[in-house]
Amino acid sequence: GWVWNQFFVPEEMNTTSHHIGQLRSDLDNGNNSFQYKLLGAGAGSTFIIDERTGDIYAIQKLDREERSLYILRAQVIDIATGRAVEPESEFVIKVSDINDNEPKFLDEPYEAIVPEMSPEGTLVIQVTASDADDPSSGNNARLLYSLLQGQPYFSVEPTTGVIRISSKMDRELQDEYWVIIQAKDMIGQPGALSGTTSVLIKLSDVNDNKPIFKESLYRLTVSESAPTGTSIGTIMAYDNDIGENAEMDYSIEEDDSQTFDIITNHETQEGIVILKKKVDFEHQNHYGIRAKVKNHHVPEQLMKYHTEASTTFIKIQVEDVDEP
């Protein structure tokens, strides 16, 4: 019968040829009376057999990632009779892996959006690298992820590539971060190959800022001839948030005379002071009112940022008009 062990040949051998093993008949007594032949895909071009001994050699560099298995056939013939000594036999040559491929991030570019002020541990995104080496061959394709840039705000789980928040961030201080992740094979051991990817992490706004008046005192004037509903001036607050989180509502906090009202221009986010009742210079030539401003939408969990609404004082001077 045929005698052989399983055949393995390392990929990327830089020698001219490489001895893989021996294939022989147990009837072969070593007197060169038998001739061994190799058949099948790769015979003669990738593998050869020493026809006298049955020794098999790889005669070219192999790439496991291109082809990991060769199925060949062997024959052994008695030179004297020309007859087969053994039935033709099929055998396998496996190409064994070396760590010749670096991890690659295939889904680049990565981009994620996460709310500002998110607590530590919040999941941002998962990055995944793939390695063309054999996952069943040692640690050649076992990857470890690490953070090259992004501390102290982000961390990455070494085995999963999950990026999490490790420190709260304020969008109003910085609204985006570039995080660089490295994937290393060989679980980081010597001889490891690595690949890197960049992740753009944008912070979305939350309503963590209340509107604050630009001025603590506004001076306005109104003619005593002005009809009710007249706009006598504007006041303005600023809010570091954006979008709907910066939408605000102005209102009167204090007006003993109940002469004025404030309406909000939602286009400009300005407060418009309106005359609610006609004024008479001879009766009262100046007024003092207090206005306050609040955000339009404030989720319950963010109310802590919105205690004590900002207020401003408005002094209104009534202008005299000659009367008939």
Partner: antibody, heavy 121, light 107 residues
Framework: EVQLLESGGGLVQPGGSLRLSCAAS????????MNWVRQAPGKGLEWVST????????YYADSVKGRFTISSDNSKSTLYLQMNSLRAADTAVYYC??????????????WGQGTTVTVSS | EIVMTQSPVTLSLSLGERATLSCRAS??????LAWFQQKPGQAPRLLIY???TRATGIPARVSGSGSGTEFTLTISSLQSEDFAVYYC?????????FGGGTKVEIK
């Protein structure tokens, strides 16, 4: 008996081309690697190129890469060396040599008598 | 590229004497070394391959030894037909490389 007979050498001007042939007999040509080796006048041996049996794999010395092409015709049991952009430094006796068996597959066990190539203006 | 260094360049010996030729590889080539003999006006002839295996028809007085980086060709008792130039050659790595040769001449 294994025999190798080179031909095609001669005098050629720099920049010119030449095609060497090596007719083989006495063995199964497609089962063996074949080589070209040269020897400049009064100098040692220099490997030029190798082709595996069947022609699947070819290898070249850096000094000839991109200028020389090795090939074979199994039906004629003949090895070729196409030499282009010839230089004075290519002047040599060119030998073809048969590869061996097994671990000596890329070796040189039988040599032809050589053909002379002279590159000169 | 593997550099093959032969020594001595010339060896002057008498008939019947022992000739010892050395060949050193710049890095390990296992046992993938061959020795060739070349006489003036002739093609090289294979003597030894696999560092120590004699080629067909080579007499027993010719022997090879060594592995890795250090190799030796020994001719135990020089005959008149042994006076020639000897080359070592590695076939472990591409490009295949030859040593510069050792000339064995009659003293």
């Amino acid at each position: 008996e294994v025999q190798l007979l080179e031909s095609g050498g001669g005098l050629v001007q720099p920049g010119g081309s030449l095609r060497l042939s090596c007719a083989a007999s006495g063995f199964t040509f497609s089962s063996y690697a074949m080589n070209w080796v040269r020897q400049a006048p009064g100098k040692g041996l220099e490997w030029v190129s190798t082709i595996s049996g069947g022609g699947a794999n070819t290898y070249y010395a850096d000094s000839v890469k991109g200028r020389f092409t090795i090939s074979s015709d199994n039906s004629k049991s003949t090895l070729y060396l196409q030499m282009n952009s010839l230089r004075a430094a290519d002047t040599a006796v060119y030998y073809c040599a048969k590869g061996g068996m097994g671990g000596y597959y890329y070796g040189m066990d039988v040599w032809g008598q050589g053909t002379t190539v002279t590159v000169s203006s | 590229e593997i550099v093959m260094t032969q020594s001595p360049v010339t060896l002057s010996l008498s008939l019947g004497e022992r000739a010892t030729l050395s060949c050193r590889a710049s890095q390990s080539i296992s046992s993938n070394l061959a020795w060739f003999q070349q006489k003036p006006g002739q093609a090289p002839r294979l003597l030894i391959y696999g560092a120590f295996t004699r080629a067909t028809g080579i007499p027993a007085r010719v022997s090879g030894s060594g592995s890795g980086t250090e190799f030796t060709l020994t001719i135990s008792s020089l005959q008149s037909e042994d006076f020639a130039v000897y080359y070592c050659q590695q076939y472990n790595y591409w490009p295949l490389t030859f040593g510069g040769g050792t000339k064995v001449e009659i003293k």
